[in-house]
């Protein structure tokens, strides 16, 4: 089972139809295709999940029939590889079905888009919503399956099945609410902004995985469990390392089936052991399924035992510090990862692989010299230094946060990023420093305590995103560099960049900063984005434009479009006043 | 740094077997992944099978499922290819190759930073 398959079934197909159930089938179905062909319509996926989900069951009736014994990229494969308009939709991914599995499964993985051309979910009246639900149940929430999975390539699908019966529940109960707006535009914000996060935060493991491979994620994993379960053993943590890489990597590489089973079989297993766990598991395993696993994924960080030694007796004092180095170095580093963490949930978990990557190195280095012992003594005090990096860089910024509040805050990000990364596209410096900048109200708000972990850890998984969305087309060699050396050290690599003293400004071009009445008619947060956009292509012009200058032209920003949207006649009023503006910011600004 | 040998290619009539040796040295601690490539001339470098040091667990290209066997002895630092009912279609150059951080995509050659020199077989009708 797994990426890596022992055959123990017959017919894997329907091995999976019967452990899952045909509605978990279907929608796992649905989601595999929608990632793996972003651009294709609903209703061709509905047709080949229908054909996929038949087939399965014929395979269900006799798993000796023919073709059942074929794999499920084999068997998905083919049905994709079926899709008419796969060359002209897609381009160089349909040369994919000309390979054999399992290169072909990889190949379309290769070809998912973080960023496809789709246009945005505009959210239909509610009475419009009501009676698509009611007319049809199960298209509308195929519909949101489809929609969400096309968007997110990388959505952890088991979750996005807890996602969809979260969504389905919010429309039973709204649609017979006297105030159906009131009952549902709530929850439905708070499912997307969620959803944005749940995506965000997979998209980092799969990018862990694909990059920097199962080492990087088993470590990343031994720290956030054993932070989250002190009380566990090390070999119990292990185990559970051990199963949660395997249903990651399974979902990472497609197999989203057998991820899904393996999620239920982790989920079972940990609710079976919680005494040797956590004692905070009570609640989730009370759960349904799709509940439970979820909330085991949320749950809060166990009491520390009480009592726990020094570290420094095992790790450093010892005399066999080298000897049982040296007799399996990755259980070594494992244990000293294990109990770092458990002693610190008030540390990243980022912080605490650099802190044993550096105890990594000193070992390798000391274990080789006249006196190991002499030599690494000191390792602890190595830890000093990064430990106080992202404790000083918080309380600066949480500070800076509380002063400017969030829209502000972001703000100084973007002018930040921007002199850092000017390549970068527009769309993507605002996104990420939109992101960046809710940092603040997440976790600055936390006791010094939660502070670091929750700031840290959030900030990986943003600059994730500008990972990924730079990859598809990378403009700066700068950008490369940190996101591609290091993993844990990408944050501290982004917030050492200086301005770029090497880029060319922008040429001046003013239809980037003119404006139409149709900015007043948009949301709140739709026209900071306007803002923002242009306070970015502000800087990309004058980088070296100081704060106050660049204050100065955006507060005449704002206060010309409260003006013109106040005016009778606002086209007019966006047409001359604007030119106003632009003249003036030139001027201000030495354009 | 970690040097891969491979040996053991050679000619051989249809139907018949080979096995294919890697030998590895320099570092290759319980993250590592093993893979076996070819390429036939005129057609780019194809995955072939991958094993996992550490477990063992193996993965093959559907054309070459239930006559090849992949294989790795650690204590040997060793990785084979047992080749069975071969094809003429299975005449190439074989490399073997190391990913030290077992990637996500195992088939994709890029992922492998360490390779062999590559040892020919060829099968004739």
């Known amino acids: 089972r797994g990426v890596f398959r022992r055959d123990a079934h017959k017919s894997e197909v329907a091995h999976r139809f019967k452990d899952l159930g045909e509605e978990n089938f279907k929608a796992l179905v649905l989601i595999a295709f929608a990632q793996y062909l972003q651009q294709c319509p609903f209703e061709d996926h509905v047709k080949l999940v229908n054909e996929v989900t038949e087939f399965a069951k014929t395979c269900v009736a006799d798993e000796s029939a023919e073709n059942c014994d074929k794999s499920l990229h084999t068997l998905f494969g083919d049905k994709l590889c079926t899709v008419a308009t796969l060359r002209e939709t897609y381009g160089e991914m349909a040369d994919c079905c000309a390979k054999q599995e399992p290169e072909r499964n990889e190949c379309f993985l290769q070809h998912k888009d973080d960023n496809p051309n789709l246009p945005r979910l505009v959210r239909p009246e509610v009475d419009v919503m009501c009676t698509a639900f009611h007319d049809n149940e199960e298209t509308f929430l195929k519909k949101y399956l489809y929609e969400i999975a096309r968007r997110h390539p990388y959505f952890y699908a088991p979750e996005l099945l807890f996602f969809a019966k979260r969504y389905k529940a919010a429309f039973t109960e709204c649609c017979q609410a006297a105030d159906k707006a009131a009952c549902l535009l709530p929850k439905l914000d708070e499912l997307r902004d969620e959803g944005k996060a749940s995506s965000a935060k997979q998209r980092l493991k799969c990018a862990s995985l694909q990059k920097f491979g199962e080492r990087a994620f088993k470590a990343w994993a031994v720290a956030r469990l054993s932070q989250r379960f002190p009380k566990a053993e090390f070999a119990e943590v292990s185990k559970l390392v051990t199963d949660l890489t395997k249903v990651h990597t399974e979902c990472c590489h497609g197999d989203l089936l057998e991820c899904a089973d393996d999620r239920a079989d982790l989920a079972k297993y940990i609710c079976e052991n919680q005494d040797s766990i956590s004692s905070k598991l009570k609640e989730c395993c009370e759960k349904p399924l799709l509940e439970k696993s979820h909330c085991i994924a949320e749950v809060e960080n166990d009491e520390m035992p009480a009592d726990l030694p020094s570290l420094a007796a095992d790790f450093v004092e010892s005399k066999d510090v080298c000897k049982n180095y040296a007799e399996a170095k990755d259980v070594f580093l494992g244990m000293f990862l294990y109990e770092y963490a458990r002693r610190h949930p008030d540390y990243s978990v980022v912080l605490l692989l650099r802190l044993a990557k550096t105890y990594e190195t000193t070992l390798e280095k000391c274990c080789a010299a006249a006196d190991p012992h002499e030599c690494y003594a000191k390792v602890f005090d190595e830890f000093k230094p990064l430990v106080e990096e992202p404790q000083n860089l918080i309380k600066q910024n949480c500070e800076l946060f509380e002063q400017l509040g969030e829209y502000k805050f972001q703000n100084a990000l973007l002018v930040r990023y921007t002199k850092k990364v000017p390549q970068v596209s527009t769309p993507t410096l605002v996104e990420v420093s939109r992101n960046l900048g809710k940092v603040g109200s997440k976790c600055c708000k936390h006791p010094e305590a939660k502070r670091m972990p929750c700031a840290e850890d959030y900030l990986s998984v943003v600059l994730n995103q500008l990972c990924v969305l730079h990859e598809k087309t990378p403009v700066s060699d700068r950008v490369t560099k940190c996101c591609t050396e290091s993993l844990v050290n990408r944050r501290p690599c982004f917030s050492a960049l200086e301005v770029d003293e090497t880029y060319v400004p922008k040429e001046f071009n003013a239809e980037t900063f003119t404006f139409h009445a149709d900015i007043c008619t948009l949301s709140e947060k739709e026209r900071q984005i306007k803002k923002q956009t242009a306070l970015v292509e502000l800087v990309k012009h004058k980088p070296k434009a100081t704060k106050e200058q660049l204050k100065a032209v955006m507060d005449d920003f704002a206060a010309f479009v409260e003006k013109c949207c106040k005016a009778d006649d606002k086209e007019t009023c966006f047409a001359e006043e604007g030119k106003k503006l632009v003249a003036a910011s030139q001027a201000a600004l030495g354009l | 740094e970690v040097q891969l040998v491979e040996f053991g290619g050679g000619l051989v009539q249809a139907g018949g077997s080979l096995r294919l040796s890697c030998a590895a040295s320099?570092?290759?601690?319980?993250?590592?992944?093993m893979g076996w490539f070819r390429q036939a001339p005129g057609k780019e470098r194809e995955f072939v099978s991958a094993i996992n040091w550490s477990d063992g667990r193996t993965v093959y290209l559907d054309s070459v499922k239930g006559r090849f066997t992949i294989s790795r002895d650690n204590a040997k630092n060793m990785v084979y290819l047992q080749m069975n009912s071969l094809k003429p279609e299975d005449t190439a150059v074989y490399y073997c190759?190391?990913?030290?951080?077992?990637?996500?995509?195992?088939?994709?050659?890029?992922?492998?930073?360490?390779w062999g020199q590559g040892t020919q077989v060829t099968v004739s009708s």
């Open positions: 190759a190391a990913d030290p951080d077992s990637r996500l995509y195992y088939t994709v050659p890029q992922n492998y930073d360490y």
């Open positions: 320099g570092r290759t601690d319980s993250a590592y992944r």
